[in-house]
């Protein structure tokens, strides 16, 4: 969480980031408030970036204002127009891109003051897994598939029967290029597998952990994955 | 009790598909297991033939490439194979069954002798 | 796929006589389950998980083994024990049966 304050002149008033991850090929968000104005034309919104000429994004009078644009965020940027009244300066970025990660500034204009925060944008690839029984396979084996990673994540086996157990003898994981030639597909496979045990398949980088478990018994399975992004610090 | 229920034509020209029937009583298909169909030739080698698992994922026996599906109606609480293109070679008494994930067959049907004749 | 090959293929014992049959799988398993048939009926379960006997199996049966070496023994052969007994392995695909041991009594 990073909190700025104005400084000189006006009085300065709090902005509040949060540190977030940007999913490539989809779209995010820049999380940013800041203390609230009765009048909507008094507020200005500007988002930039360290080491980017233009700026990000700009909102003032009630509408974008975009003629300071930068070439690289043309036609990607939008800020929620109806919640800025509240003190909502969050900016949504469309169509993710690697080269989107960097430090951003949310600057705040209000009648009440200036301020300022900064914000750690980080950009990768992450999905949720999915841990199936391999039918197809010539022993008890599970596989867990997730579509869309990047950078390269480690791939973790865990079981809840065998707590602490090592499986990186009895499971084999490999990386295949996606077609857009960043992202890949991770598949993990584990051998020697138990009937009445939850597996878990664990893939982690630096953006995002994700968990996909899977409760096997004779006669049944049972599937759950969840996903966290990592880092997500307030500012 | 568990009981499953064979039901099919006896007799298919070669060329032709057969489908069978599976009726189970007891368990609901949906609720667990994998249903499976198992043939005895009549030399009386057996072969597993395939599933359906009680989420509707199928498993099939490479041996029988593409011509075999296995279906369901769960209203019915039944189960069905069908295997294209048959030859006098799938002449054979037809089982379904229970199987248990990885292990065994707990419960059978009392088999459906098929011939494929012209 | 994984082979399953039982002997002998036909047996004979005189009753009261201790009988073994083999298994060998052309790659390990975890366990093997036997199935009773006699003739004109399906096959039963009759030891699964390797050694535990299915419900109302005589307890002179017994199944032994690990990885690609199991066995059923009757510990003293009895006129109903007369039957085709088969191996099967129903965790490696496709799942496999062995060919079978027929045993006669004398």
């Known amino acids: 969480l990073i909190i700025g304050f104005g400084i000189s002149g006006r009085h300065s008033i709090t902005v509040t980031t949060v540190a977030s991850a940007g999913n490539i090929g989809e779209d995010g968000i820049l999380s940013c408030t800041f203390e609230p104005d009765i009048k909507l034309s008094d507020i200005v919104i500007q988002w930039l970036k360290e080491g980017v000429l233009g700026l990000v994004h700009e909102f003032k009078e009630g509408k974008d204002e975009l003629s300071e644009q930068d070439e690289m965020f043309r036609g990607r940027t939008a800020v929620f127009a109806d919640q800025v009244i509240v003190g909502n300066a969050s900016l949504r970025l469309k169509n993710v891109q690697l080269t989107d990660a960097g430090t951003y500034k949310c600057y705040i204009i209000t009648s009440k003051g200036k301020g300022n925060a900064n914000l750690e944008y980080k950009t990768g690839a992450f999905s949720m897994p999915e841990v199936n029984v391999d039918y197809n396979a010539s022993s008890e084996t599970l596989r867990c598939e997730a579509p869309r990673w990047f950078p390269q994540p480690t791939v973790v086996w865990a079981s809840q029967v065998d707590q602490g157990a090592n499986f990186s003898e009895v499971s084999n994981t490999s990386f295949e290029l996606n077609s857009e030639n960043v992202t890949m597909k991770v598949v993990s496979v584990l051998y020697n597998v138990t009937i009445n045990n939850t597996y878990s398949c664990m893939i982690e980088n630096d953006i995002a952990k994700a968990t996909g478990d899977i409760k096997v018994t004779e006669s049944e399975i049972k599937r759950r994955s969840h996903l966290q992004l990592l880092n997500s610090k307030a500012s | 009790d568990v009981q499953l229920q064979e039901s099919g034509p006896g007799l298919v020209k070669p060329s032709q598909s057969l489908s069978l029937t599976c009726s189970v009583t007891?368990?609901?298909?949906?609720?667990?297991?994998?249903w499976s169909w198992i043939r005895q030739f009549p030399g009386n080698k057996l072969e597993w033939m395939g599933f359906?698992?009680?989420?509707?994922?199928?498993s099939y026996n490479p041996s029988l490439k593409n011509r075999i599906s296995i279906t369901r109606d769960t209203s019915k609480n039944q189960f069905f194979l069908r295997l294209n293109s048959v030859t006098k070679e799938d002449t054979a008494t037809y089982y379904c069954?229970?199987?248990?994930?990885?292990?065994?067959?707990?419960?059978w049907g009392q088999g459906t002798t098929l011939t494929v004749s012209s | 796929e994984n082979v399953l090959t039982q002997s002998p293929a036909i047996m004979s014992a005189s009753p009261g006589e201790k009988v073994t049959m083999t298994c060998s799988a052309s790659s390990s398993v975890s366990y093997m389950h036997w199935y009773q048939q006699k003739s004109s009926t399906s096959p039963k379960l009759w030891i699964y998980d390797t050694s535990k006997l299915a419900s109302g199996v005589p307890g002179r049966f017994s199944g032994s083994g690990s990885g690609n070496s199991y066995s059923l023994t009757i510990s003293s052969m009895e006129a109903e024990d007369v039957a085709t007994y088969y191996c099967f392995q129903g965790s490696g695909y496709p799942f496999t049966f062995g060919s079978g041991t027929k045993l006669e009594i004398k």
């Open positions: 007891g368990y609901s298909i949906t609720s667990g297991y994998f």
């Open positions: 359906i698992s009680y989420d509707g994922t199928n």
């Open positions: 069954a229970r199987k248990l994930l990885w292990l065994r067959f707990d419960y």
